[in-house]
Interface confidence: low
């Protein structure tokens, strides 16, 4: 009577030739303790004898008969709760149905468990999340419907044939609900992992290869771009032309839009892979990049620093400090925008060239009254000489000299 027996165990167990099988099992006999237990292989009920026929793998009866399989098959249960079994080693011809024939004082029951034994170690199964995005941590799962105390195994992760650096967490389950070995690997894929092969390798305790499963990574990523510029050093003179080309080295999914940015701001009406700048001015100097978007988001190229070279602009002089008191120190600074930076400066005092003064700064440690006047400068670089600016006035304050009485 089935209502008097309650069993819990995995419906089907999997193993391979030479491994072992551990069958977690619990039961409840409502009318008292177990008196007899027989484990059949592929049992069939014989109506004539009202008994089950089949290979007896294990027998535990009052008269203590022991089949020859007893060493290979172990009943690890008890008389009222536990019906756990172990078969070690397990063979290909063990595949089929295991029948647990249970008898108490008044009741009998045949419980069936499926056993699937393959010729070779079957492969694990890699489970990937539905979508993998670059730089977002995902968990790769490798699941094998096998675990047995007498046959240790390990699951190893490989990326393109090389062990993966990230530490994997392996767990096993040997419960009445499920039997499995699982390895979980937390992994932050980069775009360059797209299309690469990930392998979960089943190995025995000595690291010998048993089987594997492979998947090809589909890593969704923003477009990866390369920017090329002509001339290649991105250094031009005012009035020259510049061409920048944007190349998509990888995009998953396909790209949808293209734009160009200068110093972080989008350039209007520039939506092709080529940016042509004709007769450039110095105001067009700056950091350029292209931006290409797909469904994941925008990707940006490296920045190209465009240097538009020009002769020095009209210079100005800054004086620290004016008015100056006689005997104090004063510094003059020649300010002139130029690219490349000026290599030479010419200084003028009251319209006359100051000999030996060719630096950006002029320092006078001790001001005298005759230092007063207009100071101007001219900056020079490889492209030319700048226009001399209007200059600046130095006022020198000093006490009365040669006081005469009138």
């Amino acid at each position: 009577d089935s209502s008097k027996w309650v069993f819990e165990h995995p419906e089907t167990l999997y193993a391979w030739e030479g491994a072992c099988v551990w069958i977690p099992c619990t039961y409840r006999a409502l009318d008292g303790d177990l008196e007899s237990f027989i484990l059949f292989h592929n049992p069939e009920y014989n109506k004539n004898t009202s008994k089950f026929d089949g290979t007896r793998l294990y027998e535990s009866t009052k008269d203590g008969k022991v089949p020859s399989e007893q060493k290979r098959v172990q009943f690890l249960g008890d008389k009222n709760k536990n019906c756990t079994l172990s078969i070690h080693p397990v063979h290909l011809n063990d595949s089929g149905q295991l029948g647990l024939r249970m008898e108490s004082k008044t009741e009998k029951w045949m419980e069936r468990i499926h056993l699937n034994v393959s010729e070779r170690p079957f492969p694990p199964h890699i489970q990937l999340p539905p979508e993998i995005q670059e730089s977002q941590e995902v968990t790769l799962t490798c699941l094998l419907n096998f675990s047995c105390y007498g046959y240790p195994i390990q699951l190893q992760w490989l990326l393109e044939g090389v062990p993966m650096r990230q530490a994997a967490v392996t767990s096993t389950s040997l419960t009445i609900k499920s039997v499995f070995t699982r390895s979980e690997l937390k992994f932050s894929p980069q775009w360059s992992h797209h299309g690469k092969i990930v392998t979960c390798q089943l190995q025995d305790a000595d690291g010998k290869f048993l089987s594997n499963d492979t998947v090809q990574l589909n890593v969704k990523h923003t477009p990866k771009l390369e920017i090329k510029v002509t001339p290649s050093d991105a250094i031009v003179r005012e009035g020259d032309s510049v061409t920048m080309t944007c190349e998509v080295s990888s995009s998953n999914p396909e790209y949808t839009t293209v734009s160009w940015l200068k110093d972080g701001t989008s350039l209007k009406k520039q939506n092709t892979f080529t940016l042509n700048l004709r007769e450039v001015t110095k105001d067009q100097s700056g950091k350029y990049c292209c931006q290409v978007s797909n469904d994941v988001g925008p990707g940006r190229s490296e920045e190209v620093f465009l240097q538009v070279q020009y002769a020095p602009e009209p210079s100005t002089v800054q004086i620290l400090h004016s008015p100056a008191v006689e005997g104090s120190q004063v510094e003059f600074l020649c300010m002139s925008l130029a690219n490349p930076l000026p290599t030479n400066y010419t200084w003028y005092h009251n319209g006359k060239e100051m000999q030996g003064r060719t630096e950006e700064k002029v320092h006078i440690p001790k001001i005298l009254p005759w230092h007063a006047g207009t100071y101007s400068c001219v900056a020079e670089n490889i492209l030319g000489t700048g226009q001399r600016g209007p200059g600046a006035e130095l006022d020198v304050q000093y006490p009365p000299k040669k006081v005469t009485t009138v």
Partner: antibody, heavy 118, light 116 residues
Framework: EVQLVESGGGFVKPGGSLKLSCAAS????????MNWFRQAPEKGLEWVAY????????YYADTVKGRFTISRDNAENTLFLQMTSLRSNDTAMYYC???????????WGQGTSLTVSS | QLVLTQSSSASFSLGASAKLTCTLS???????IEWYQQQPLKPPKYVME???????STGDGIPDRFSGSSSGADRYLSISNIQSEDEAIYIC?????????????FGGGTKVTVLG
């Protein structure tokens, strides 16, 4: 006891060729990826080449790509490094190294010396 | 780019504790690294690997005076009760597969001197 014994080093002229060998013992050779590393006199260590257990995956450092060939004979427990078009900057002590787990280079041979000079 | 940074030298008194640092490039702060010991005219010797969580496993024949730990992108090798035979260059290494190329990168090494 794990042992790695390199041989085949010596003097060679620039442009010449040489083959290094490494005899492994004390462990199951076919269970491990193997590497060649080198160390130039008074310089740091440099990885040269890697070969997987079954020779399916092979990697080379950019400095030797196209000139050096790594191979192994699992039946003979031997690792090889065939070197061609040798240059003076290939002068170094060459080490045969076992790789375990996550890139742990856990056993190193005593090394064999290569001098490339005219 | 995968880079390991080490200080070039360090001195410790006999019997003292030593702590060596190896810093990974910031984008690789989760990587496992390896420590190696190299004594003059000898090949490197594997000391241990150190993981991001600080757990470590030592190589064969390494005394339990050696231990590893971690903080952020820094990986440490600690030697308690340092002995004269511990005088050597300690080099950290890290491997990775980038695009289709395997690389194994070393730090510059820290030369450890034991005083007294």
């Amino acid at each position: 006891e794990v042992q790695l014994v390199e041989s085949g080093g010596g003097f060679v002229k620039p442009g010449g060729s040489l083959k290094l060998s490494c005899a492994a013992s004390g462990f199951t050779f076919s269970d491990y990826g193997m590497n060649w590393f080198r160390q130039a006199p008074e310089k740091g260590l440099e990885w040269v080449a890697y070969i997987s257990r079954g020779s399916h995956t092979i990697y080379y450092a950019d400095t030797v790509k196209g000139r050096f060939t790594i191979s192994r004979d699992n039946a003979e427990n031997t690792l090889f490094l065939q070197m061609t078009s040798l240059r003076s900057n290939d002068t170094a002590m060459y080490y045969c190294v076992r790789m375990a787990g996550y890139y742990a280079m856990d056993y190193w041979g005593q090394g064999t010396s290569l001098t490339v000079s005219s | 780019q995968l880079v390991l940074t080490q200080s070039s030298s360090a001195s410790f008194s006999l019997g003292a504790s030593a702590k060596l640092t190896c810093t990974l490039s910031s984008q690789h702060s989760s990587y496992i690294i390896e420590w190696y010991q190299q004594q003059p005219l000898k090949p490197p010797k594997y000391v241990m690997e150190v993981k991001k969580d600080g757990s470590h496993s030592t190589g064969d024949g390494i005394p339990d005076r050696f231990s590893g730990s971690s903080s952020g992108a820094d990986r440490y090798l600690s030697i308690s009760n340092i002995q004269s035979e511990d005088e050597a260059i300690y080099i950290c290494g890290v491997g990775d597969t980038i695009k289709e190329q395997f690389v194994y990168v070393f730090g510059g090494g820290t030369k450890v001197t034991v005083l007294g």
